[in-house]
C-alpha cells in the first residue's frame, strides 16, 4: 500500500490525462481523486500506465467501492481488468 502523503502544490489532478503517467506512485495516491477516476475510467486505458501505477488506481477504486464496482466502471477497466482477483469479480453485480 502506498504511504499517504500530501499532494504537492500544483499537482492535484483535475482530469485523468497523459501527464499522470509521470506521477510517482505516492503522487497518484495523493493527487488523484477516486471519484474523478471513477467518472473518467474511459480515459485510463488510453494512457500507458505501468502495472505498478494501475495497482494504485485499483486501490483507489477499491476504497471508493468496497462492495464492488458499478457497471459504469467495469465497462472501462481495460488493462486494469488484468489486476482483478476472483474475489474482486465476485463482488460485481453485472446484468
Amino acid at each position: 500500500e502506498v504511504e499517504k502523503t500530501a499532494c504537492p502544490s500544483g499537482k492535484k489532478a483535475r482530469e485523468i490525462d497523459e501527464s499522470l503517467i509521470f506521477y510517482k506512485k505516492w503522487e497518484l495516491e495523493a493527487c488523484v481523486d477516486a471519484a474523478l477516476l471513477a467518472t473518467q475510467m474511459d480515459r485510463v486505458n488510453a494512457i500507458p500506465f505501468t502495472y505498478e501505477q494501475l495497482d494504485v488506481l485499483k486501490h483507489k477504486l477499491d476504497e471508493l467501492y468496497p462492495q464492488g464496482y458499478p457497471e459504469s466502471v467495469i465497462q472501462h477497466l481495460g488493462y486494469l481488468f488484468l489486476k482483478m482477483s476472483p474475489e474482486d469479480i465476485r463482488k460485481w453485480n453485472v446484468t
Epitope: P48, T50, Y51, E52, Y79, L82, K83
Partner: nanobody, 118 residues
Framework: QVQLVESGGGLVQAGGSLRLSCAAS????????MGWYRQAPGKERELVAV???????LYADSVKGRFTISKDNYTNTLYLQMNSLKPEDTAMYYC????????????YGQGTQVTVSS
C-alpha cells in the same frame, strides 16, 4: 520473462549528447509500452520518456525538447537520444517494458550510468 539490456551510458560534458540503447529479449512488436526511467543518487526513480503503440511518445517536462525516445522493431531495440545534457541529468538510466499480452509485470533492465560534468 523479458530481459532488457541497456548500453550507451558514459561521461559527457554539459551541452553534449548521448544515445542510450536497450536490447529486448523478445519481439518488441509484442510490447505495448516501453520507457526510460532514471534515478539519481538519493532521489526517487522517475519516468522520463514513454513510447506506446502505435509509436505514441510522451516526455516528462524536465526532458521535453531535449530527449527523444524511439524503437526499432527489426532489431528489438529501444533508444533514448539525449541532447543538450545538463548536470542534473546525471543518473542511472533504466529501460522498462510493460503491457505485454496478459502479463501484468513491469520489466526493468539493470541500468546504464550517465554522468554529465559541468
Amino acid at each position: 520473462q523479458v530481459q532488457l539490456v541497456e548500453s550507451g551510458g558514459g561521461l559527457v560534458q554539459a551541452g553534449g549528447s548521448l544515445r542510450l540503447s536497450c536490447a529486448a529479449s523478445i519481439s518488441i512488436r509484442r510490447i505495448n509500452a516501453m520507457g526510460w526511467y532514471r534515478q539519481a543518487p538519493g532521489k526517487e526513480r522517475e519516468l522520463v520518456a514513454v513510447i506506446s503503440s502505435p509509436n505514441k511518445t510522451l516526455y516528462a517536462d524536465s526532458v521535453k525538447g531535449r530527449f527523444t525516445i524511439s524503437k526499432d522493431n527489426y532489431t528489438n531495440t529501444l533508444y533514448l537520444q539525449m541532447n543538450s545534457l545538463k548536470p542534473e541529468d546525471t543518473a542511472m538510466y533504466y529501460c522498462s517494458a510493460w503491457r505485454i499480452g496478459v502479463d501484468t509485470t513491469d520489466y526493468y533492465g539493470q541500468g546504464t550510468q550517465v554522468t554529465v560534468s559541468s
